[in-house]
């Protein structure tokens, strides 16, 4: 198990590829399974605050050195261990740079904002729920909710890369009160902008507003579903959209109760109960596989709704991908 | 869906021998392909592989003496000074998709006779 | 370099019997092992990746099981059509080497 591990390539040190020490070398880690739980426990390891994502690795420059090993194959981590090394790994037995893990963090004590006037959520559980912050000339202030609405929520969902905007009673608890100034009120959004800082409001720093009033947002990652390949919208190779990308469903457990809440999702009539051939005619995918193991009482309204292993687990490949055909 | 050896043929000892893998109805140029030999009544070896970058990987003791070459729908194995322990079938093979080292799509193979 | 020992070399089983092939390696590799069948003048077949994991289109009457350094395949109610060599391979490839070994293989004869 590694002794050392560090990310490479990044703006900072909080970013990069995934790079472990093994008996004196570094080398790096194979994509497989590599969720934001992993990167959770990576940037907890590194000092480096939450998680903010899973890019893939060969995004940063310089890439892996030729002569670079990946060392480990997968790793799972349930998100709640201190060290990479506390999680379940597997050896590596076939993987290439081209499947270099990255990982991001928040890089708590770092004044790097990848957006010059930027946004953020904080005290909340994750980068997608929380205060709403706004970085204006070096100093984080806190939003007033006076003229909030949903339409800037989801602007700043947007600018977060944290999908849609949930509407929520919320409020900031007594103990995330912000201890900052309070930047502005009376936002204005169309919720088109594509930035918070791009809507109209009151004047910058000029409120009668206290912490009580601070604005706090939940975004949830989207979740959509589409089958490709087919003649039509109600056939083919089932992909569903997490964290901004799309990836193939494994058919380990498939069957069904899956086919019908696919079809009813999608508006698609009925389940046409193909058979393994059929299934298989519309070929493999390419690019991640999110979900494993998916089971389904057959009630549910949305592929979401049913159980499956965490996002990104699985022990397959694109020639186990599930392929649903309705009946249109 | 098919790969195809062609090539196979008698030649002599240290002449040069180029055999090609064509695909047909499958994209080689973004997968992995090997190339494997089995003299008559033996088991299976591994020569080498290309990837769909390019690079390539040999057996130890295929360095130097096989090169692998590919375009988007061939990939060539050329063998140079050949010896007569080198009689075989030659097959090429793709991995499966996403991986670079086991082979689900095999051609049938090309027979290479050495002898002077 | 890594051996894999094949075990029988030959082996002779009646129809709806069962046969088990085993396959050593000579240093753990966790789970790197696929499982191939050739039958005369005709090229490999996958049938097992990943030391267990069933090809598509494989009968599960073909099981592969183990890890480290002892693996197994597995053919249950044998048919006639399972005439063939089965050979075993260890796979390896970390960025920089490949490593791609077979087994001496088994014929098995079905009567």
């Known amino acids: 198990s590694p002794s050392g591990v560090r990310l490479v390539g990044g703006l900072h040190r909080c970013e990069g590829r995934v790079e472990v020490e093994q008996k004196g070398q570094w080398g790096t880690v194979c994509d497989d399974g590599w969720d934001i739980k992993d990167v959770a426990v990576l940037c907890r390891e590194l000092g480096c605050g939450a998680a903010s994502g899973t890019p893939s690795g060969i995004l940063y420059e310089p890439p892996a050195e030729k002569e670079q090993k990946v060392l480990i194959q997968s790793v799972s981590c349930t998100g709640t261990e201190d060290t990479l090394a506390q999680c379940e790994q597997e050896e590596v037995y076939d993987c290439s740079h081209d499947e270099d893990a990255g990982a991001s963090c928040e890089n708590p004590e770092s004044s790097f904002s990848p957006v010059p006037e930027g946004v953020r959520l904080a005290d909340g559980p994750g980068h997608c729920k929380g205060r709403v912050e706004v970085k204006h000339q070096n100093q984080w202030y806190t939003v007033c909710q006076t003229g909030w609405s949903l339409r800037a929520a989801k602007v700043v969902c947007r600018q977060l890369g944290c999908g849609r905007a949930v509407l929520t009673q919320k409020r900031c608890n007594k103990h995330a009160y912000g201890r900052k100034p309070i930047w502005l009120s009376q936002m204005s959004c169309s919720g088109r902008e594509a930035t918070l800082q791009d809507c109209p409001s009151g004047p910058w720093g000029k409120n009668t507003c206290n912490h009580d009033e601070d604005t706090w947002v939940e975004c949830e990652d989207p979740f959509d579903l589409r089958l490709v390949g087919g003649d039509n919208l109600c056939s083919g190779r089932l992909e569903v959209l997490h964290k901004g990308v799309w990836g193939s469903v494994c058919d380990d457990n498939w069957g069904e109760k899956e086919d019908q809440v696919v079809c009813k999702q999608l508006g698609c009539g009925k389940s046409l109960s193909p058979s393994f051939r059929d299934r298989k005619c519309y070929g493999p995918g390419v690019g991640r596989i999110w979900l494993d193991n998916v089971r389904c009482s057959g009630e549910e309204q949305s592929l979401e709704q049913c159980q499956h292993r965490f996002w990104g687990f699985h022990d397959c490949t694109h020639q186990e991908d599930v392929a649903v055909i309705c009946s249109g | 869906q098919s790969l195809k050896e062609s090539g196979g043929r008698l030649v002599k000892p240290d002449e040069t021998l180029t055999i090609t893998c064509t695909a047909s109805?499958?994209?080689?140029?973004?997968?992995?392909v090997g190339w494997f030999r089995q003299a008559p009544g033996k088991g299976l070896e591994w020569i080498g592989i290309?990837?769909?970058?390019?690079s390539t990987y040999y057996a130890t003791w295929a360095k130097g003496r096989f090169t692998i070459s590919k375009t988007s729908t061939t990939v060539d194995l050329k063998l140079t000074s050949p010896t007569t322990e080198d009689t075989a079938t030659y097959l090429c093979?793709?991995?499966?998709?996403?991986?670079?080292?086991?082979?689900?799509?095999w051609g049938q193979g090309t027979l290479v006779t050495i002898s002077s | 370099e890594l051996d894999l020992t094949q075990t029988p070399s030959s082996v002779e089983a009646a129809v709806g019997g069962t046969v088990t092939i085993k396959c050593q390696a000579s240093?753990?590799?966790?789970?790197?092992l696929a499982w191939y069948q050739q039958k005369p003048g005709q090229p490999p077949k996958l049938l097992i990746w990943?030391?267990?994991n069933l090809e598509s289109g494989v009968p599960p009457r073909f099981k592969g099981s183990g890890s480290g350094t002892e693996f197994t395949l597995t053919i249950s109610d044998l048919e006639c059509a399972d005439a063939a060599t089965y050979y075993c391979?260890?796979?390896?490839?970390?960025?920089?080497?490949?490593?791609?070994?077979f087994g001496g293989g088994t014929e098995v004869v079905v009567k």
């Open positions: 093979a793709r991995a499966f998709p996403g991986y670079n080292t086991f082979f689900n799509f």
């Open positions: 109805g499958i994209d080689l140029t973004s997968g992995t």
């Open positions: 290309i990837r769909g970058s390019g």
């Open positions: 240093e753990s590799i966790g789970n790197a």
């Open positions: 990943k030391a267990s």
């Open positions: 391979q260890r796979y390896y490839f970390n960025g920089v080497s490949v490593e791609i070994v």
